[in-house]
């Protein structure tokens, strides 16, 4: 059967200054390839967050994404900004050259309360 | 620079037990899975044993399974492994490495040697 | 197990290919040079292709179903060594080893 991505939160709302957690589940491991978080759809959509690389400025993974049964893609924001609003995506790709784009999850919009 | 540094190889009798230490420097230890990989005189590479970043989760190959303990302190960015029973098949190179995001391996330390001997 | 020839020889500037066959699409596959026994190995490539930013151009490294390939364009002396493939399975969170490519520059 094929992978489903959960992200079993609709919408989620955080005063300015603070962080917040988006969650997102897989249902396999398989088949193999990496999962990235993106804001918005389409051709102008921002990569936030990838679990192949570290970098990622206020971003930080929920659960310890290197047990090798993780099923968890949950990301922290930390220090949450109004440019922050918007909807997220956890999606999952398949290995390739280059990696393809299997399945996302069903979104979640994020609300940035002024403080 | 990321840098590897086993230590803790010894000439023991079967049957012994020996703890292997890899310190880590230059990178994260914390965010980071780890795994001892070891080679025999004159054969390939063998992965022994894995280790989540939390330290939580721990992975063994067969042929240690049940006599080797895989550890790490990440306030001490110090990995570890524990070997009980041991026998003349696990005189080897022994290896620390740091895992990819996908469980394979970017940097290896210089190694460190087993010998098991009567 | 992974399986990849045990040997394979060029001249100065030619191409080497080595593939490794056997991990399952259910693998990522890595390349790791040895250049004297019990020497530290050297990651050239992870992830299928990913190549570490001090590991020089002329290694790359593909994968097409269960089988990956290393190809050396312009294969120099100093890359005589033993090449390991390695992979991961997602299935049964095991690295595996083949046996290793010894290569000798004519």
């Known amino acids: 059967t094929e992978v489903k991505v959960i992200q079993p939160e609709k919408s989620v709302s955080v005063a300015a200054g603070d962080s917040t957690v988006l969650n997102c589940t897989l249902t396999s491991l398989l088949p193999v390839g990496p999962i990235r978080w993106y804001r918005g759809v389409g051709q102008s959509r921002q990569l936030i967050y990838s679990f192949t690389t570290e970098h990622f400025p206020r971003v930080t993974n929920v659960s310890d994404a290197t047990k090798r049964s993780n099923l968890d893609f949950s990301i922290r924001i930390s220090n949450v900004t109004p440019e922050d609003a918007g909807t997220y995506y956890c999606v999952k790709f398949q290995r390739g050259s280059p990696d393809t784009e299997i399945q996302s999850g069903g979104g979640t919009e994020v609300y940035v309360l002024a403080k | 620079d990321v840098q590897l540094v086993e230590s803790g190889g010894a000439v023991v009798r079967p049957g012994e037990t020996l703890r292997l230490s890899c310190t880590a420097s230059?990178?994260?230890?914390?965010?980071?899975?780890m795994s001892w990989v070891r080679q025999a005189p004159g054969k390939g590479l063998e992965w022994v044993s894995g280790?989540?970043?939390?330290?939580?989760?721990?992975y063994y190959a067969d042929s240690v399974k049940g006599r080797s303990t895989i550890s790490r302190d990440n306030s001490k960015n110090t990995l570890y492994l524990r070997m009980s029973s041991l026998t003349a098949e696990d005189t080897a190179v022994y290896y620390c490495a740091r895992e990819t995001w996908n469980h394979l391996f970017d940097y290896w330390g210089l190694g460190t040697l087993v010998t098991v001997s009567s | 197990a992974l399986t990849q020839p045990a040997s394979v020889s060029a001249n100065p500037g030619e191409t080497v290919k080595i593939t490794c066959s056997g991990g399952?699409?259910?693998?990522?596959y890595g390349w790791y040079q040895q250049k004297s026994p019990g020497s530290a190995p050297v990651t050239l490539i992870?992830?299928?292709?990913k190549r570490p930013s001090d590991i020089p151009s002329r290694f790359s490294g593909s994968a097409s179903g269960s089988t990956a390939t290393l190809t050396i364009t312009g294969v120099q002396v100093e890359d005589e060594a033993v090449y390991y493939c390695?992979?991961?399975?997602?299935?049964?969170?095991?690295?595996?080893f083949g046996a290793g490519t010894t290569l000798t520059v004519l």
């Open positions: 280790i989540s970043a939390s330290g939580s989760d721990t």
């Open positions: 390695g992979g991961y399975d997602y299935t049964t969170y095991v690295n595996t």
């Open positions: 230059g990178f994260t230890f914390s965010s980071y899975a």
């Open positions: 992870h992830s299928d292709d």
């Open positions: 399952g699409t259910s693998s990522y």
